[in-house]
């Protein structure tokens, strides 16, 4: 109905107009991660707060067992920030000895799981080498982009090292998605 | 009205359909900060350009006195990037002496102020240790997420050290929000 | 039509309501860059995958020759992530000799080209000094914000050094835009 005067007519209009307020949306915030069994050769998934504080799910977007469940097909904007913190890696020690080395790193992956598809799909990845020289370091990795998702798709956030995730504040580490 | 043919009817439809073009939106860009009085124990707030160059506010989203004023309740996507630049901190000097140390850091916080609520709410935080070894360093912190806001809420961007903000270009440091 | 019961009436309603599903949208993903001639004094532009894997363009948003072509005036959210990777710059070697130095850097710019306007407009810039001490480093720069664009505008992503871009995975380096 773009650019057209919007007026009642006896001709039916099939464009799926819908109220913005009823679109699936979620913003999840960090909680302390408890030690769990991880799948071999797969980064562990974070679990999330979905209703307290700044966190919410609405309009059939549900959170369950580390996954956001997509209730309706369409284009979604998906985002996450994970703040990592740690102590100096041995990277700097090896370096001081003058030998080149593979740096330590921190990685965040937003992953899509489709039940009818055997392998998860990596939608977004942020990965950073960490060869910090100070004794304590901290830094965020932010990701966000638009993807076409199908009803029933599941989204999760995986990280390279769950023990480095800063779980202290809901504004530092979060995960969200909304239907465009 | 999802998935339903949209046709005139004698039955009233209550879904709040509205034109996308009339939704509150703003994109603010950096201006040079002049030395001012800061609130005690609170990171200083940045002030912004709201009408020149790439900056704009529209549809009742107003900017005044460092705040974006939310004109209508709903779910908003809020984002900011702050580019910092500085010179080597003494962090590296201490480090060379072999003593562990608390690193210098740079922090951005997007804060919500609700008049009826005594304390500001931190919506988003990006914080990064800075133990750079080069003489001059520069780097951005980017934040963005969706929040449910109420009419009358105010948004601001606070930074850990206002004098390290790169104010030279409107594409390096910015702040925006739009109703979904 | 905000906050108003939506019912047919003999009075014409002019608000340009339109289905969300028919808005211009694109998500482009990295491909290996082939050596090309760059414009003098301008960062080289990346070219992109627009239809395989996670990449898509829809609703008249077209990709051609490194540019996303804007088919309709309006407010767009534009985003990109570029993951860079490299080897230690001589920056650290110079530093070890105790001399301050200009750091190496990595930069991403999202640029708008308007045919009727002689100069491209830089919409977003992420720039970071790189004085890594490890032998190999990698890190992403993420950008995203909302801009008012005109039909016919073209968007591209420019980088400071095309040879440092990580082209190995579609989730590491990407570029997208969607009409709000």
């Amino acid at each position: 109905l773009k650019g057209q005067e919007f007026a009642p007519s006896h001709q039916q209009v099939y464009a799926p107009l819908r109220a913005d307020g009823d679109k699936p949306r979620a913003h999840l915030t960090v909680v302390r991660q408890t030690p769990t069994q991880h799948f071999k050769n797969q980064f562990p998934a974070l679990h999330w707060e979905h209703e307290l504080g700044l966190a919410f799910t609405k309009n059939r977007m549900n959170y369950t067992n580390k996954f956001l469940l997509i209730p309706e097909s369409g284009d979604y904007f998906i985002y996450s920030q994970v703040t990592f913190r740690g102590m100096t890696s041995e990277c700097s020690e090896i370096r001081q000895a003058g030998r080149p080395n593979k740096p330590d790193s921190i990685t965040v992956v937003i992953t899509k799981v489709t039940d009818s598809y055997p392998e998860p799909t990596q939608l977004l990845m942020g990965t950073k080498s960490v060869c910090e020289v100070g004794s304590n370091w901290f830094q965020p990795i932010y990701l966000g982009a638009m993807f076409s998702l199908q009803e029933g798709d599941k989204l999760m956030v995986n990280v390279s090292d769950i023990s480095l995730v800063d779980y202290t504040k809901e504004d530092k580490t979060f995960f969200g998605a909304f239907l465009l | 009205l999802k998935g339903q043919e949209f046709a005139p009817s004698h039955q009233q439809v209550y879904a709040p359909l509205r034109a996308d073009g009339d939704k509150p939106r703003a994109h603010l860009t950096v201006v040079r900060q002049t030395p001012t009085q800061h609130f005690k124990n609170q990171f200083p707030a940045l002030h912004w350009e709201h009408e020149l160059g790439l900056a704009f506010t529209k549809n009742r989203m107003n900017y005044t006195n460092k705040f974006l004023l939310i004109p209508e309740s709903g779910d908003y996507f809020i984002y900011s990037q702050v580019t910092f630049r500085g010179m080597t901190s003494e962090c590296s000097e201490i480090r060379q002496a072999g003593r562990p140390n608390k690193p210098d850091s740079i922090t951005v916080v997007i804060t919500k102020v609700t008049d009826s609520y005594p304390e500001p709410t931190q919506l988003l935080m990006g914080t990064k240790s800075v133990c750079e070894v080069g003489s001059n360093w520069f780097q951005p912190i980017y934040l963005g997420a969706m929040f449910s806001l109420q009419e009358g809420d105010k948004l601001m961007v606070n930074v850990s050290d206002i004098s390290l903000v790169d104010y030279t270009k409107e594409d390096k440091t910015f702040f925006g929000a739009f109703l979904l | 039509l905000k906050g108003q019961e939506f019912a047919p009436s003999h009075q014409q309603v002019y608000a340009p309501l339109r289905a969300d599903g028919d808005k211009p949208r694109a998500h482009l993903t990295v491909v290996r860059q082939t050596p090309t001639q760059h414009f003098k004094n301008q960062f080289p532009a990346l070219h992109w995958e627009h239809e395989l894997g996670l990449a898509f363009t829809k609703n008249r948003m077209n990709y051609t020759n490194k540019f996303l072509l804007i088919p309709e005036s309006g407010d767009y959210f534009i985003y990109s992530q570029v993951t860079f990777r490299g080897m230690t710059s001589e920056c650290s070697e110079i530093r070890q000799a105790g001399r301050p130095n200009k750091p190496d850097s990595i930069t991403v710019v999202i640029t708008k080209v308007t045919d009727s306007y002689p100069e491209p407009t830089q919409l977003l810039m992420g720039t970071k000094s790189v004085c890594e001490v490890g032998s190999n480093w990698f890190q992403p720069i993420y950008l995203g914000a909302m801009f008012s664009l005109q039909e016919g505008d073209k968007l591209m992503v420019n980088v400071s050094d095309i040879s440092l871009v990580d082209y190995t995975k579609e989730d590491k380096t990407f570029f997208g835009a969607f009409l709000l």
Partner: antibody, heavy 118, light 107 residues
């Protein structure tokens, strides 16, 4: 409004030290870098260094290293610049200046004339 | 250290004239270039930052341009109060350095 008020003129002998003060008002003293810039009679401007009043961290131009000491007293919002082993070519007006960013000088003190003469 | 040069070192102009002062850096300083005005016996006054952005309260007849190594300060229509010495200063890296100044005198 933002104001920087410096101490009065000084006359010193070669080899002595001078300490110039700069009292700040109208802004959060600990939030902004304080710079010191000097200007010899009839000459241009020369940056000496800065202090970050919050951390006390300093950075000075190579030519002054070992001779200049920048300190601050946050309780009275005052910065100090001490220059030791004075020579006749240190005769200059010494300015403190504060910037909204660490790389520029928005507001200047009125200047302190330091004369080095035997 | 980054060396800043200015030209001319002095110029004579009349009220209403358009005046241009150039500043060159010995290496690229991006847009980290500031301009100051100084009158005899007074502290300098901050005019322009980021090469081209006017400091609050500075008249619009002042403008700046340039990026990298070459910069310009322009006064579109010289006023009596504009007769002074103008300095450029790079804020790109330490030590921050000033140009030698350009003295604008009454013709």
């Amino acid at each position: 409004q933002v104001q920087l008020v410096q101490s009065g003129a000084e006359v010193k002998k070669p080899g002595a030290s001078v300490k110039v003060s700069c009292k700040a008002s109208g802004y959060t003293f600990t939030g902004y870098y304080m710079h010191w810039v000097r200007q010899a009679p009839g000459q241009g401007l020369e940056w000496m260094g800065w202090i970050h009043p919050n951390s006390g961290g300093t950075n000075s131009a190579q030519k002054f290293q070992g001779r200049v000491t920048m300190t601050r007293d946050t309780s009275i919002s005052t910065a100090y610049m001490e220059l030791s082993r004075l020579r006749s070519d240190d005769t200059a007006v010494y300015y403190c200046a504060v910037g909204g960013s660490y790389d520029a000088f928005d507001i200047w003190g009125q200047g302190t004339m330091v004369t080095v003469s035997s | 250290d980054i060396v800043m040069t200015q030209s001319p070192s002095s110029l004579s102009a009349s009220e209403g004239d358009r005046v241009t002062i150039t500043c060159r850096a010995s290496q690229s300083i991006s847009s980290y270039l500031n301009w100051y005005q100084q009158k005899p016996g007074k502290a300098p006054k901050f005019l322009i930052y980021g090469a081209s952005r006017l400091q609050s309260g500075v008249p619009s007849r002042f403008s700046g341009s340039g990026s990298g190594t070459d910069f310009t300060l322009t006064i579109s229509s010289l006023q009596p109060e504009d007769f002074a010495t103008y300095y450029c200063q790079q804020g790109y890296s330490s030590p921050f350095t000033f140009g030698p100044g350009t003295k604008v005198e009454i013709k």
